[in-house]
């Protein structure tokens, strides 16, 4: 089942998955001035068996001005920097999740991909939070969130993390403070029903990659 909810927003923190559960989809997004090739995949799909997982399909971008040929351009340093600076400063996963069965690693970049990667997570996915530069973490539990299925609805668990604006390099001090409840995330909106068409559409997309499903959104 796909998670049809936004992971919790922690002020002054970013989140990142260290590995992606089978069933996760990654949009084939292209940077400005480029588009997917006409017959190209809509997304990459993490698939696999009990021993090995990998990303199916390849993302390919072509210049918007060019119709038939894919333009192979090496990303400029500032583009590489833009992607790099959005990453968390240091990995902080308690286990090497990428080595877990049923998980895919971060896929390598493709030519002219967009600067932000758009994932569609599945139930059981875990993401890890870290304070952005200039903030330090106060927490009383795991700085992680898991997408769970409860009574037919998906929801993300709340990470126990507060990022305070003190300019210190220590990321995870041993201090405890009461967890602030996140603003703008009312309880009534923390989960939504997953429609019965989810798996059908996901399966069809995995098979063909060509169907236009913008109007049959499964989330």
């Amino acid at each position: 089942e796909l998670c049809d909810d936004d992971p919790p927003e922690i002020p002054h923190a970013t989140f990142k998955a260290m590995a992606y559960k089978e069933g996760t989809m990654l949009n084939c997004e292209c940077k400005r001035g480029f588009r997917r090739i006409k017959s190209g995949s809509l997304y990459m799909l993490c698939t696999g068996n009990s021993s090995h997982s990998s990303w199916d399909n390849q993302c390919q971008c072509t210049s918007s001005a060019t119709r038939n040929t894919t333009k192979q351009v090496t990303p400029q340093p500032e583009e590489q920097k833009e992607r790099k600076t959005t990453e968390m400063q240091s990995p902080m996963q308690p286990v090497d999740q990428a080595s877990l069965p049923g998980h895919c690693r971060e896929p390598p970049p493709w030519e002219n991909e967009a600067t932000e990667r758009i994932y569609h997570f599945v139930v059981g996915q875990m993401v890890y939070y870290q304070c952005v530069q200039g903030y330090r973490a106060l927490h009383r539990g795991p700085a992680e969130s898991v997408c769970k299925m409860t009574h037919g609805k998906t929801r993300w668990t709340q990470p126990q993390l507060i990022c305070t604006g003190e300019m210190e390099t220590s990321q995870f001090p041993g201090e405890e403070k009461p967890q602030a409840s996140p603003e703008g995330r009312p309880e009534s909106e923390t989960s939504c029903l997953v429609t019965t068409t989810d798996f059908q559409i996901q399966t069809e997309m995995a098979a063909t990659m060509e169907t236009s499903i913008f109007t049959t959104e499964y989330q």
Partner: nanobody, 130 residues
Framework: EVQLVESGGGSVQAGGSLRLSCEAS?????????MGWFRQAPGKEREFVGA????????SYADPVKDRFTISRDNAKSTVYLQMNNTKPEDTAVYYC??????????????????????WGQGTQVTVSS
């Protein structure tokens, strides 16, 4: 790759209500995008009205419309809505729907600056008369 078409604009008396819709189409997934509304009055710059995250968990509004306007989305219909209540003459403008991409690498899921939006609709006129 994403086409956005606004509808629902028109004329309304001050204090009245109007509901704008923005339908998305294209070979992609609607829930990939956060959605926002902007407006531009004659002779003025385009300004942020409000935005909603990919799954509708988070919303943000500009101060002039807080408590009067509400943004919602229906991912099954690939549509985002702007419910305008208690309208004022200063709400008169062309209203634009726009889409932005978001990944967790950025710590604000709702974007408020027009430069952060990648896809735009053509706009729909709203006129509020006193």
């Amino acid at each position: 790759e994403v086409q956005l078409v606004e509808s629902g604009g028109g004329s309304v008396q001050a204090g009245g209500s109007l509901r704008l819709s923005c339908e998305a189409s294209g070979r992609t997934l609607f829930s990939s995008y956060g959605m926002g509304w902007f407006r531009q009055a004659p002779g003025k710059e385009r300004e942020f009205v409000g935005a909603i995250s990919r799954f509708g968990t988070y919303t943000s509004y500009a101060d002039p419309v807080k408590d009067r306007f509400t943004i919602s989305r229906d991912n099954a219909k690939s549509t985002v809505y702007l419910q305008m209540n208690n309208t004022k003459p200063e709400d008169t403008a062309v209203y634009y729907c726009a889409a932005y991409t978001y990944s967790g690498s950025f710590y604000s899921t709702v974007k408020t600056h027009h430069d952060e939006y990648r896809y735009w609709g053509q706009g729909t006129q709203v006129t509020v008369s006193s």
